[in-house]
């Protein structure tokens, strides 16, 4: 019962986690940036993995996809890759874990097969969660480094001036969604791996017992007949099993043998 609950909970937690990873990957608010020239023409920027958006104080919002932009930061491509790998692994893990669920019967699937599938999906969820956490963390690190790197003022040869505006890039909502989702997927994966141990059929450690076929001697007597089984009180046919010191288990573990005469 506990195994089924652990497996089911692991599946649900991972499902929520993967849904969160997909949501984070699609979100535009990976980084946000405030730029205030004045209260009227205030501009609010936010960037995602796929497009960059600007929202003005008037309410006007415009988004541009990165396909129009050459030379995307390599880190951005790496983050995209990590998130996609996380989603793909998570999706496959979900598919596998559906068939591995103890509460779902598919044909004559053995518990050992379900245990293996549970372990496989658990590992997939763990890797998926780690990919998401890594992707989000790489992005967060990129924001922090880029902010500290650009500070100097520059001058153009045209007589005009170019200077860096101390605009602050802050972590967008998608980063927090990604971290939480990655963590949930990871936890779900661990739960699946724990459930796998309970699902695996335990090999019973039977003590080796040698069964000796006892001689069947039947004595005919005028008062009827008696079947001796070798375990009876018939001293003539009694076999003595002398195995030395016996454990409690051994004493009561001999199977009863029925002779039908």
């Amino acid at each position: 019962m506990a195994v089924t609950a652990c497996q089911g909970l692991g599946f649900v937690v991972s499902l929520i986690g993967i849904a969160g990873i997909i949501a984070a990957t699609c979100m535009d608010q990976w980084s946000t940036q405030d730029l205030y020239n004045n209260p009227v023409t205030a501009v609010f920027n936010y960037q995602g993995l796929w497009r960059s958006c600007v929202r003005e104080s008037s309410g006007f919002t415009e988004c541009r996809g990165y396909f129009t932009l050459l030379g995307l930061p390599a880190m951005l491509q790496a983050v995209r890759a990590l998130m996609i790998v996380g989603i793909v692994l998570g999706a496959i893990g979900l598919l596998v874990s559906i068939f591995a669920l103890k509460c779902i019967r598919i044909g004559s699937m053995e518990d050992s097969a379900k245990a293996n599938m549970t372990l496989t999906s658990g590992i997939m969820f763990i890797v998926s969660g780690l990919c998401a956490i890594a992707g989000v963390s790489v992005f967060a690190n990129m924001l922090v480094t880029n902010f500290w790197m650009s500070t100097a003022n520059m001058y153009t040869g045209m007589g005009g001036m170019v200077q860096t505006v101390q605009t602050r890039y802050t972590f967008g909502a998608a980063l927090f969604v990604g971290w939480v989702a990655g963590g949930l997927t990871l936890i779900g994966g661990v739960m699946m791996c724990i459930a796998c141990r309970g699902l695996a059929p335990e090999e019973t450690n039977y003590k080796a017992v040698s069964y000796h076929a006892s001689g069947h001697s039947v004595a005919y007597k005028p008062g009827g007949f008696k079947a001796s089984t070798g375990f009876g009180s018939n001293t003539k046919n009694k076999k003595i099993y002398d195995g030395g010191a016996r454990t409690e288990d051994e004493v009561q573990s001999y199977p009863s043998k029925h002779d039908y005469v």
């Epitope: 501009v43 600007v54 006007f60 415009e62 951005l76 505006v165």
Partner: nanobody
């Protein structure tokens, strides 16, 4: 790099009009806002008007409201300042300024033109 080039300044009589133009050239991801600042000798540079390149929200300093109009042509990467009913106190060097998102996940650049002189004679 982004460069701004202003034009349209000159000498004009009080009550007259002028139209300043500012063209942005170079490479960038998005120009956020473009505006006009002015500076008179011994004084600090002050914002006259600015406009967002996306939605076209505008801002004017009180002293020019009703007399100056800022507009933009995104296709030409140009911002205009139409000035009518000019006063002698409008005499100044007018600078074009653009707030540019040059590359992703980088701080914005504040790009300035070299300035154009507007002289209003009484």
């Amino acid at each position: 790099a982004v460069q701004l080039v202003e034009s349209g300044g000159g000498l004009v009589q009080a009550g007259g009009s002028l139209r300043l133009s500012c063209v942005a050239s170079g490479s960038w991801f998005r120009i956020q806002t473009m505006g006009w600042y002015r500076q008179t000798p011994g004084k600090q540079r002050e914002l006259v008007a600015d406009i967002t390149t996306g939605g076209g929200s505008t801002y004017y300093v009180d002293s020019v409201k009703g007399r100056f109009t800022i507009s933009r042509d995104n296709a030409k990467n140009t911002v205009y300042l139409q000035m009518i009913n000019l006063k002698p106190e409008d005499t100044a060097a007018y600078y074009c300024q653009a707030n540019v998102l040059e590359a992703l996940f980088r701080p914005n650049l504040e790009v300035w033109g070299q300035g154009t002189l507007v002289t209003v004679s009484s």
